[in-house]
Amino acid sequence: WELTILHTNDVHSRLEQTSEDSSKCVNASRCMGGVARLFTKVQQIRRAEPNVLLLDAGDQYQGTIWFTVYKGAEVAHFMNALRYDAMALGNHEFDNGVEGLIEPLLKEAKFPILSANIKAKGPLASQISGLYLPYKVLPVGDEVVGIVGYTSKETPFLSNPGTNLVFEDEITALQPEVDKLKTLNVNKIIALGHSGFEMDKLIAQKVRGVDVVVGGHSNTFLYTGNPPSKEVPAGKYPFIVTSDDGRKVPVVQAYAFGKYLGYLKIEFDERGNVISSHGNPILLNSSIPEDPSIKADINKWRIKLDNYSTQELGKTIVYLDGSSQSCRFRECNMGNLICDAMINNNLRHTDEMFWNHVSMCILNGGGIRSPIDERNNGTITWENLAAVLPFGGTFDLVQLKGSTLKKAFEHSVHRYGQSTGEFLQVGGIHVVYDLSRKPGDRVVKLDVLCTKCRVPSYDPLKMDEVYKVILPNFLANGGDGFQMIKDELLRHDSGDQDINVVSTYISKMKVIYPAVEGRIKFS
């Protein structure tokens, strides 16, 4: 019996087609992805093949103005239109709190939404009961397939699930659910979830009875043969893991942003054992037509976005200096504003010992592309912020050793004075440079804001200590020459859309007046 699994993950609000790098589509003839194009390909495959499941491994939420405006309603609407069969909850599905998941998505989705390792307690337990499930048994042709969901147990540090959801260890939570499916005579089981490729492989290895793992969170690109675009494969598709009980378990992921549609064909024997598996992600490039009816629907929904872009988010009573002349040479108040917003967006009081789990922000000055003049009645719009942060990036959470941070700050000024983008703006950090010293030895003082303290204060950076830092995904990926971050980071979790982070902060503060306050000094 053959099953075709079509899968997406980490779509992050890319409902419209995008450029090759998943930013805003500029030249339509070169654009990719988007739900209209995805629908075309899904329908083609459904037409051609008998037993097809369309699955999503989480993080549909967050990433573009679509999510900012529609807050998940767009996800439910278009996933329903594409007739998804199941979805796993990702960490970003909790970005607007549990209510922001329940109302727009859980109550509106016409497909099951899954996670076996999230347990509700207290008053939420009855409110959310039945709205998401640990597993679902789906009829596929003449057979049944069990889908069991999982979500990163780090979600409380990455999003806003509140205090009434407990995120258990994935493997511990999955095993009893898989066992239950077995007792129900379900012998073909897919683990669908959002914990990253390393956990996907562990699940394949450790959870008895799981036949296939369809994952997300780490934006992993797997491919067999010559890859069709810029993404470099982390391994073959599918990635085969030998389980502890000796089975070959295919593990797949399909990069991110709706650029690819994962396509996996699995052959099962009559006892539900995987005999063979093959496939590849399908690049959704512009040679795949956008479905006209879905496209028309997208255009209808788009109207509200254009209106939103010009509405006032808040006011500034000071000039927001985002000029290259400032942000690439010294502390600039636009950099301070953005870093403050980044920290504010990551306030998660998850432990009595810590006032927060993260206190530090770094931001490449070259990523700040425009100032905002306060003389326009102080008005700040999404449109203004899009000029400041035009690249459609995210502000991510990483864990780094102090020694890596020191290298990053040395890199920040290694060729100071040439208006290069690597000069770092900061939050929760006090740095002093001595430019008379040779490159690689210019950081004379580096103090960081404590987290394990009731009264935050600045302490000298410790080389061997592991620190959490919020930074643009561009830096996490080694951009602007920050190879040391990419090479030495100990953990990397994708965060929220950059503009969304700053816009939310401005809306919250209502009136802003960021200052230049001595975060960066030169001796």
Partner: antibody, heavy 121, light 107 residues
Framework: QVQLVQSGAEVKKPGSSVKVSCKAS????????LSWVRQAPGQGLEWMGE????????YYNEKFKGRVTITADESTSTAYMELSSLRSEDTAVYYC??????????????WGAGTTVTVSS | DIVMTQSPDSLAVSLGERATINCKAS??????VAWYQQKPGQPPKLLIY???YRYSGVPDRFSGSGSGTDFTLTISSLQAEDVAVYYC?????????FGGGTKLEIK
């Protein structure tokens, strides 16, 4: 290389049936769709229907109202098109053509050489 | 059924000159349009798929454009071997339908 080799010309009486074959080679037969397209003398092209050999799923042009049946034999990588209740206006060249539904070439990328079917009393 | 209306029915162009063939769909077919070249006694040959993508091995003097309902095949500099009948076809909805064809000749 990809080849679609069709059976030879046929002369048929009105009311009878014809079965044309199309043997595929040079690619994985079950991973592509196969369509049948006909062309009456001096006329344009007309799509009759298609089959996806991997699933056996078939789709037909309503115009042929149950007269056409498309089948596929995986073991020999051969597709067949049977047209029944033949009439003189069914005189045409019948082509099989491959369709890459997993790829991005929206069109028929390989064609058979065609089979001439003449319907005459 | 989606009707594909091709124009002109026939076209005579001098060698080295540009030839343009149009195709209009009766409803929005996105970019799901292919163009074929057919010479006497031969099966059609795929030239352009998805409205504007040149099929492998097709000379770059052939180009396609359009989306929605209006599509164009252009031969930038006509060669003697381009004499043939050209067909557009929509691949958006079954039954897949072809235009009536355009006979291209040398003037």
């Amino acid at each position: 290389q990809v080849q679609l080799v069709q059976s030879g010309a046929e002369v048929k009486k009105p009311g009878s049936s014809v079965k044309v074959s199309c043997k595929a080679s040079g690619y994985t037969f079950t991973s592509y769709g196969l369509s049948w397209v006909r062309q009456a003398p001096g006329q344009g092209l007309e799509w009759m229907g298609e089959i996806y050999p991997g699933s056996g799923n078939t789709y037909y042009n309503e115009k042929f109202k149950g007269r056409v049946t498309i089948t596929a034999d995986e073991s020999t990588s051969t597709a067949y098109m049977e047209l029944s209740s033949l009439r003189s206006e069914d005189t045409a060249v019948y082509y099989c053509a491959r369709y890459d539904y997993l790829g991005s070439s929206y069109g028929f990328d390989y064609w058979g050489a065609g089979t001439t079917v003449t319907v005459s009393s | 059924d989606i009707v594909m209306t091709q124009s002109p029915d026939s076209l005579a162009v001098s060698l080295g000159e540009r030839a343009t063939i149009n195709c209009k769909a009766s409803q929005d077919v996105s970019t799901a349009v292919a163009w074929y070249q057919q010479k006497p006694g031969q099966p059609p040959k795929l030239l352009i798929y998805s409205a504007s993508y040149r099929y492998s091995g097709v000379p770059d003097r052939f180009s396609g454009s359009g989306s929605g309902t209006d599509f164009t095949l252009t031969i930038s500099s006509l060669q003697a071997e381009d004499v043939a009948v050209y067909y557009c076809q929509q691949h958006y909805n079954t039954p897949y339908t072809f235009g009536g064809g355009t006979k291209l000749e040398i003037k």
